[in-house]
């Protein structure tokens, strides 16, 4: 009896991982054994494909060939036993097209009111991905185990902490990596759950903002008890993006190490150009709190993040306030090439009730202003990034008069 | 192979100085923290501190703050310990160590040098 | 500085049994802790990071647990290559400090 060519041949590939998988075509035999050849593109000879020759079964694995993964590659079957059947080829494929991302490895720190995960590519030193190790991303789903409310954080890259969160919980997550350079999306990691643990004595210091007086930073944040020590560390922001698991190593701010106030100033030399993420941590000399959240800091947006310049156009009702770029020392205006949005408080000279306004345009009315009433305007700006969380000083206060009834047409 | 391979067995007098080496394969010391760690019979572990090989910052437990001194080499790929002003309480096993990822503590350890201090 | 309390200086155990050494921190540090194994005359060896995670080629009967304060290694299964002294170490802050040990006998 003549034996029939295996069908339906299917290539898997994840990761450095290539599978191969098919059907019988004719189950009623038995003893039968499959082999592969393979042929690379240009070539006119087929190769027998090591690791799939004599298998018994309907799987092989070929990940020991060591394969050009740009180069297409055909691939040919056929079943064997006292006589051998005809060879079913396959379609031809390039193994990077073809294949998928492989789960990454996650392994999670926990806090009271965080949780770090460390992500890395499932495979190392991945033949596959040779080419664009420092292109993956990560996203994550994360869950409260009690409530199963799932949460997505996309874009996040090999170190990641998630912030806020309920002391002694547990909360599940999954991972997945991309590589949006190739419209690739991986598989989730499989479910890795943590407890966060028992809330700390200390909490950590917030609000931590930088802001820029004369030729020095002044790094600002809150805290709840006095008598602490605190310090300051920095690392460049690029090295979260490293894969797999890195060392990060975090730096003291020299004149932020051991300070008893909760600001800092250092000059500004002790950052070159560029985005840094900065760390405070508080101590009473017996117990340390954990790290604060990392704010994200870049040297270009702090130095040159000016308070806005605007004009007021007075009617009786009302503002129009024309908003201009800043000017720097020599009267020329400042071009930032990053959207802003701007907050703009306004208030009756006589009184001290603030009123406040944002608004991305650079063109605000302030409306619902009594006529001939001398109204004081200032106003400040803000980067829209939510991560560089970065703000101007406000501008000094500009009064002026609104007009009598009726010329607000 | 990553290996850790310490300096031999020394033998000082009281009030000299001795300077331990920690010479790395397998791994390029700048990519890491190197540790070190003193051990004495029945009194467990200590550590010493670390230093940084990149750039020579260094981290020192109190207790040995001005006892040890912690530099490094990189293009010899090698760590060390400089101790001074050596007594008795000196006499211990000391240990180098690395750290290589922010997830690890310290994961290859060298195979320990023998410091005894006795006039 | 943190104090890593290991309360049991020893520990007699049987071949086969399951035995668990427990390490208290003085203050909270997360997850940030490892345990070490150190036969007489050898250098440690590392078991476990961050609390839970086995280092590449120790046996699975080795399982690190605890978050906070609060921290055990459970041996299972205990074999006569286990008999050694168990440290835990914090590496949450500096200076990083370590346990007192634990001494594994075997019966």
């Known amino acids: 009896k003549n034996l029939k060519s295996p069908q339906k041949v299917e290539v898997d590939i994840i990761d450095d991982n290539f599978i191969l998988r098919w059907n019988r075509s004719d189950e009623s035999v038995g003893n039968v054994t499959f082999s592969f050849d393979y042929q690379k593109t240009g070539m006119d000879n087929w190769i027998k494909l090591s690791g799939c020759q004599n298998i018994t079964s309907t799987k092989c694995n070929f990940s020991s060939l060591k394969l050009n993964v740009y180069e297409e590659i055909k691939l040919r079957i056929r079943a064997e036993k006292e006589n051998t059947s005809s060879w079913y080829e396959v379609d031809s494929f390039t193994p990077f097209r073809k294949a998928q991302i492989g789960p990454p490895e996650v392994h999670l720190e926990a806090e009271d009111k965080a949780i770090v995960i460390h992500i890395s590519p499932g495979t190392k030193d991945s033949v596959m991905w040779a080419l664009d190790g420092l292109s993956f991303t990560y996203s994550l789903v994360i869950w409260k185990n009690s409530s199963g409310v799932e949460e997505r954080i996309e874009n996040i890259y090999s170190r990641h902490k998630i912030y806020k969160l309920s002391p002694e919980t547990t909360y599940c997550l999954k991972v997945k990596a991309a590589l949006l350079t190739s419209w690739k999306i991986g598989v989730y990691s499989p479910v890795h759950c943590i407890k966060t643990t028992v809330e700390n004595e200390l909490p950590p210091p917030e609000n931590i903002e930088v802001s820029v007086q004369n030729q020095n930073y002044v790094l600002k944040w809150d805290y709840t008890y006095a008598n602490m020590t605190f310090q300051v560390q920095w690392l460049h922001a690029f090295l979260k993006r490293n894969p797999g698991n890195h060392l990060y190593k975090w730096k003291q701010i020299p004149d932020c190490e051991n300070v008893k106030t909760t600001q800092c100033v250092f000059p500004q030399n002790v950052f070159q150009k560029g985005i840094y993420l900065l760390r405070v941590q508080a101590s009473d000399g017996n117990n340390t709190s954990f790290w604060s959240e990392e704010i994200k800091f870049d040297t270009e947006i702090q130095a040159f993040l000016l308070p806005p310049v605007f004009n007021i156009r007075s009617l009786s009702d009302s503002f129009h306030i024309y908003i201009g770029a800043p000017k720097q020392s020599g009267n020329t205006p400042v071009i930032q090439d990053y959207p802003l949005i701007y907050e703009i408080i306004f208030w009756e000279n006589t009184s001290n009730a603030e009123r406040k306004i944002i608004e991305k345009k650079t063109d605000v009315t302030v409306p619902n202003l009594k006529p001939l009433t001398v109204y004081c305007v200032k106003a400040r700006a803000h980067t829209m990034d939510e991560k560089l969380n970065k703000s101007s000083v406000f501008s000094d206060a500009v009064c002026e008069k609104t007009k009598p009834g009726n010329t607000s047409k | 192979e990553v290996q850790l391979q310490q300096s031999g067995a020394e033998l000082v007098k009281p009030g000299a100085s001795v300077k331990l080496s920690c010479t790395a394969s397998g791994f390029n010391i700048k990519d890491s923290y190197m540790h070190w760690v003193k051990e004495r019979t029945e009194q467990g572990l200590e550590w010493i501190g670390r230093i940084d090989p990149e750039d020579g910052e260094t981290n020192y437990a109190p207790k040995f703050q001005g006892k040890a001194t912690l530099t490094a080499d990189t293009s010899s790929n090698t760590a060390y310990l400089q101790l001074s002003g050596l007594t008795s309480e000196d006499t211990a096993v000391y240990y180098c160590?690395?750290?290589?990822?922010?997830?690890?503590?310290?994961?290859?350890w060298g195979q320990g040098t023998s410091v005894t201090v006795s006039s | 500085d943190i104090v890593m309390t290991q309360s049991q200086k020893s520990m007699s155990t049987s071949v086969g049994d399951r035995v668990s050494v427990t390490c208290k921190a003085s203050?909270?540090?997360?997850?940030?802790v490892a345990w070490y194994q150190q036969k007489p005359g050898q250098s440690p060896k590392p078991l476990i990071y961050?609390?839970?995670y086995r280092y590449s080629g120790v046996p699975d009967r080795f399982t690190g647990s605890g978050s906070g304060t609060d921290f055990t290694l459970t041996i299972s299964n205990v074999q006569s290559e286990d008999l050694a002294e168990y440290f835990c170490q914090q590496y949450n802050n500096y200076p990083w400090t370590f346990g007192g040990g634990t001494k594994l006998e075997i019966k």
């Open positions: 160590a690395r750290r290589v990822s922010s997830l690890y503590a310290m994961d290859y």
């Open positions: 961050l609390a839970s």
């Open positions: 203050q909270n540090v997360g997850t940030n």
